[in-house]
């Protein structure tokens, strides 16, 4: 807390400019009008203020807006955003994607901080759903964003947003998340032709039921082993040897290297040895 002291004669700030970097903390507090600061927030980032000086500027904004900053100020916070606490951010009403992008840019290259997580949560809740433009933006800054959401949160993602998802965005998703995303992907991509459809749906197949895997096995898709290993064990177990052979195509030879790992291990144990022998891979049930 900075003590309230009178502004020395001639030091009253008429605008936010470089001269302020030479002000002591108490002088900033006494000589910078909060309303002036709010209207000229876009200048703050061009001035090399110290962290201590930024603390004072934040304090002034907090006093001016005790109920939370307006979006006109939030959009121009820049590095001052790093000074905000999740509690501060919970008071905000962020509706513009441009504002969101501006603040994510400040944190770019870093792990998702509690502040950023709170900001995103406020933004998505304000919009009511995770639309395509928002998802595009969030996954561009944080490729793992989608997989940080619970299945419950993913339930509000409209199928149209799935077009924004890249394979790497799903790398850390677990089966429960893919459970929810896979049907949305099926809806989104179903009008594509066979080979294009498989390219798009492949990353989501960890949520596919047995019947869909059987259907894919009839379409010469040549699923790679990495995708096969991410399939739900309960979905793989009912597949016959012939179906797995068709599903994997030339990649079927990779089963040997994965025979001790799920779901391959469990699937092998469910098959008749005679059927496994037809693969010529030396798999033992």
């Amino acid at each position: 807390e900075v003590e309230k002291t009178a502004c020395p004669s001639g030091k009253k700030a008429r605008e936010i400019d470089e001269s302020l970097i030479f002000y002591k903390k108490w002088e900033l507090e006494a000589c910078v009008d909060a309303a002036l600061l709010a209207t000229q927030m876009d200048r703050v980032n061009a001035i090399p203020f110290t962290y201590e000086q930024l603390d004072v500027l934040k304090h002034k904004l907090d006093e001016l807006y005790p109920q939370g900053y307006p979006e006109s100020v939030i959009q121009h916070l820049g590095y001052l955003f790093l000074k905000m606490s999740p509690e501060d951010i919970r008071k905000w009403n962020v509706t513009s994607l441009e504002t969101l992008k501006a603040l994510l840019e400040v944190n770019k290259g870093h792990e998702m901080s509690p502040q950023v997580a709170t900001l995103i949560d406020r933004f998505v809740k304000g919009r009511g759903q995770l639309d395509k433009d928002t998802l595009d933006t969030l996954t561009a800054f944080y490729p793992g964003y989608l997989c940080s959401l619970s299945p419950e949160e993913l339930s509000s993602v409209p199928p149209s947003s799935i077009w924004a998802v890249r394979p790497q965005d799903l790398d850390t998703c677990d089966p429960r998340q893919l459970d929810v995303l896979y049907p949305k992907a099926r809806l989104a991509f179903q009008n594509m032709n066979g080979s294009e459809y498989f390219v798009k749906i492949q990353s989501f197949l960890g949520g596919a039921p047995t019947e869909d895997l059987k259907a894919l096995s009839q379409q010469n898709v040549s699923m790679d082993l990495a995708t096969f290993m991410k399939l739900r064990t309960d979905a793989v177990l009912p597949l016959t040897v012939a179906e797995v052979q068709k599903l994997l195509g030339p990649h079927v030879e990779g089963l040997k290297a994965e025979e001790r790992h799920r779901p391959v291990r469990d699937w092998i144990l469910r098959q008749r040895q005679d059927d496994l022998d037809t693969l010529g891979l030396g798999l033992q049930g």
């Epitope: 199928p159 049907p183 259907a215």
Partner: nanobody
């Protein structure tokens, strides 16, 4: 082409349990990816209540989780919603929804026409 029809009492007293059933005709719900419920309070947007997935996993809106149960009976081609300890804030049009097409080349999302449930004494 599936048809979904919600049924249940249109008026429920506060603190009681709201029970709705969704009856599906025109096809088997065994071929669905999920069976879910969504509601729309008067003058507000849609709110997802919860869904049961083909995998057997059930997911509920965290704000309603302690009060909601969704179950499915594929033999009767029905699924149901129970919402306990209701208040006036639970007054809404309730919709059942499902996405059919497991194992098929096409898939489609279907919705019931909705049923208004009013919570009042």
């Amino acid at each position: 082409q599936l048809q979904l029809q919600e049924s249940g009492p249109g008026l429920v007293k506060p603190s009681e349990t709201l029970s709705l059933t969704c009856t599906v005709s025109g096809g088997s719900i065994s071929n669905s990816y999920y069976w879910g419920w969504i509601r729309q309070p008067p003058g507000k947007g849609l709110e997802w209540i919860g869904s049961i997935y083909h995998s057997g996993n059930t997911y509920y809106n965290p704000s309603l989780k302690s009060r909601v149960t969704i179950s499915v009976d594929t033999s009767k081609n029905q699924f149901s919603l129970k919402l306990s300890s209701v208040t006036a804030a639970d007054t809404a049009v309730y919709y059942c929804t499902t996405q059919n097409g497991v194992g098929a080349t096409t898939t489609e999302e279907y919705w019931g026409q909705g049923t208004l449930v009013t919570v009042s004494s």
